[in-house]
């Protein structure tokens, strides 16, 4: 898979492949995988990809199901890169406060907050 | 501060306090703090709260600025609790795939993805 494929296109293709291979993937009815119990997905990327690893190890590879797992691995690579970018630039307090305000604003409007 | 205050109200109050104390907080013009370079804030909670810790250690405490940092500490507690909930329940593959599909769907529509 060329890693040059834009991440947005990669995500779209992965969604389609996930749908295509769902029946094959759920064939293992005894397997248990940690599933987050809230919808703030970005907080749970580590567990999601651990689960993907568990699923991959239990799935017969070949054909486009292999492409699905390759895509997921590229998405993980992208997310790991984003996580690295969290701490790379040490700036002035002013810029940090802008980001903190933005973060709290997003938390206020977009997060699914349980009481 | 009563921890019983709903998190959503806590976030709103914290945004207001942040605005109120901005001048005091930026008084330290030389301090360097990691500022994430993308807007997928949830991926960067660790760095955000490390930055808050650095800022707190450099800020003269007292009055409502102390309340600001107490609030931020409660928000961290809430997020840490959410992170714990990422791996608490082990479910069937079916449920995991539902969550994965939802995650990729959110990534597809809501994430700010750079090429």
């Amino acid at each position: 898979i060329p890693t040059e494929i834009p991440t947005s296109a990669l995500v779209k293709e992965t969604l389609a492949l996930l749908s295509t291979h769902r029946t094959l993937l759920i064939a293992n009815e005894t397997l248990r995988i940690p599933v987050p119990v809230h919808k703030n997905h970005q907080l749970c990327t580590e567990e999601i990809f651990q689960g993907i690893g568990t699923l991959e190890s239990q799935t017969v590879q070949g054909g486009t199901v292999e492409r699905l797992f390759k895509n997921l691995s590229l998405i993980k690579k992208y997310i790991d890169g984003q996580k690295k970018k969290c701490g790379e630039e040490r700036r002035r307090v002013n810029q940090f406060l802008d980001y903190l305000q933005e973060f709290l604003g997003v938390m206020n409007t977009e997060w699914i907050i349980e009481s | 501060i009563p921890t019983e205050i709903p998190t959503s109200a806590l976030v709103k109050e914290t945004l207001a306090l942040l605005s109120t104390h901005r001048t005091l907080l930026i008084a330290n013009e030389t301090l360097r703090i990691p500022v994430p370079v993308h807007k997928n804030h949830q991926l960067c909670t660790e760095e955000i709260f490390q930055g808050i810790g650095t800022l707190e250690s450099q800020t003269v405490q007292g009055g409502t600025v102390e309340r600001l940092f107490k609030n931020l500490s409660l928000i961290k507690k809430y997020i840490d609790g959410q992170k714990k909930k990422c791996g608490e329940e082990r479910r069937r593959v079916n449920q995991f795939l539902d969550y994965l599909q939802e995650f990729l769907g959110v990534m597809n529509t809501e994430w700010i993805i750079e090429s």
């Epitope: 690295k84 970018k85 701490g87 790379e88 630039e89 040490r90 700036r91 002035r92 810029q95 | 013009e29 030389t30 301090l31 360097r32 990691p34 370079v37 490390q50 810790g53 650095t54 250690s57």
Partner: antibody, heavy 111, light 105 residues
């Protein structure tokens, strides 16, 4: 630039190769003849800038990622701006690490 | 300041900061060391107070915490003739120390 008259402006271009300016930050440092090093400012990989407050009103740093070029502009030159001007690469890392330096550009300020 | 030593000797140079360069949150010390040989640009030796840059000989060691830091050359070689600068990485601006000139006897 070599020789520049007082009150004029200095413009230096630092052209990089082997890495991308979208991933690496670039700092500017100067060194007057026979003296020590002075940090001037930085343009971060993200495009943000930070300057030495002593020069903030006269200094601007910009870049063109596609051309792999970083630009320094210093206005209202004074004789004590005479120095060797270096650009230096800072890898994407939370610790400052100026791991590659240019050979430098000499500036003489004289009327 | 300047130091004059013979080849093979151990040398230590110090760098003192007016403020602590230690981040209590992550226990990192924000200080770098550079070597500048005559007619050349500076070269990075140490970052994070004690991490040796790749390719730098292991005779160079950085140590210290808070406000007091040291660069040690365990066995000075003729090619170590240079000026050594420390640089603050904790806060703006990223000030350099005044430099220590190392002379070889």
């Amino acid at each position: 630039p070599g020789l520049v008259a007082p009150s004029q402006s200095l413009s230096i271009t630092c052209t990089v190769s082997g890495f991308s300016l979208t991933s690496y930050s670039v700092h500017w440092v100067r060194q007057p003849p026979g003296k020590g090093l002075e940090w001037l400012g930085v343009i971060w990989a993200s495009g943000g800038t930070d300057y030495n407050s002593a020069l903030m009103s006269r200094l601007s740093i910009s870049k063109d990622n596609s051309k792999s070029q970083v630009f320094l502009k210093l206005n209202s030159l004074q004789t004590d701006d005479a120095a060797m001007y270096y650009c230096a690469r800072d890898p994407p890392f939370s610790l400052l690490r100026l791991d590659f330096w240019g050979q430098g550009t000499t500036l003489t300020v004289s009327s | 300041s300047s130091l004059s030593v013979s080849a093979g000797e151990k040398v230590t140079m110090s760098c003192k900061s007016s403020q602590s360069l230690l981040n209590s949150g992550n226990q990192k010390n924000y200080l770098a060391w550079y070597q500048q040989k005559p007619g050349q640009p500076p070269k990075l030796l140490i970052y994070g107070a004690s991490t040796r840059e790749s390719g730098v000989p292991d005779r160079f060691t950085g140590s210290g915490s808070g406000t007091d830091f040291t660069l040690t050359i365990s066995s000075v070689q003729a090619e170590d003739l240079a000026v050594y600068y420390c640089q603050n990485d904790h806060s703006f601006p990223f000030t350099f120390g005044s430099g220590t000139e190392l002379e070889i006897k």
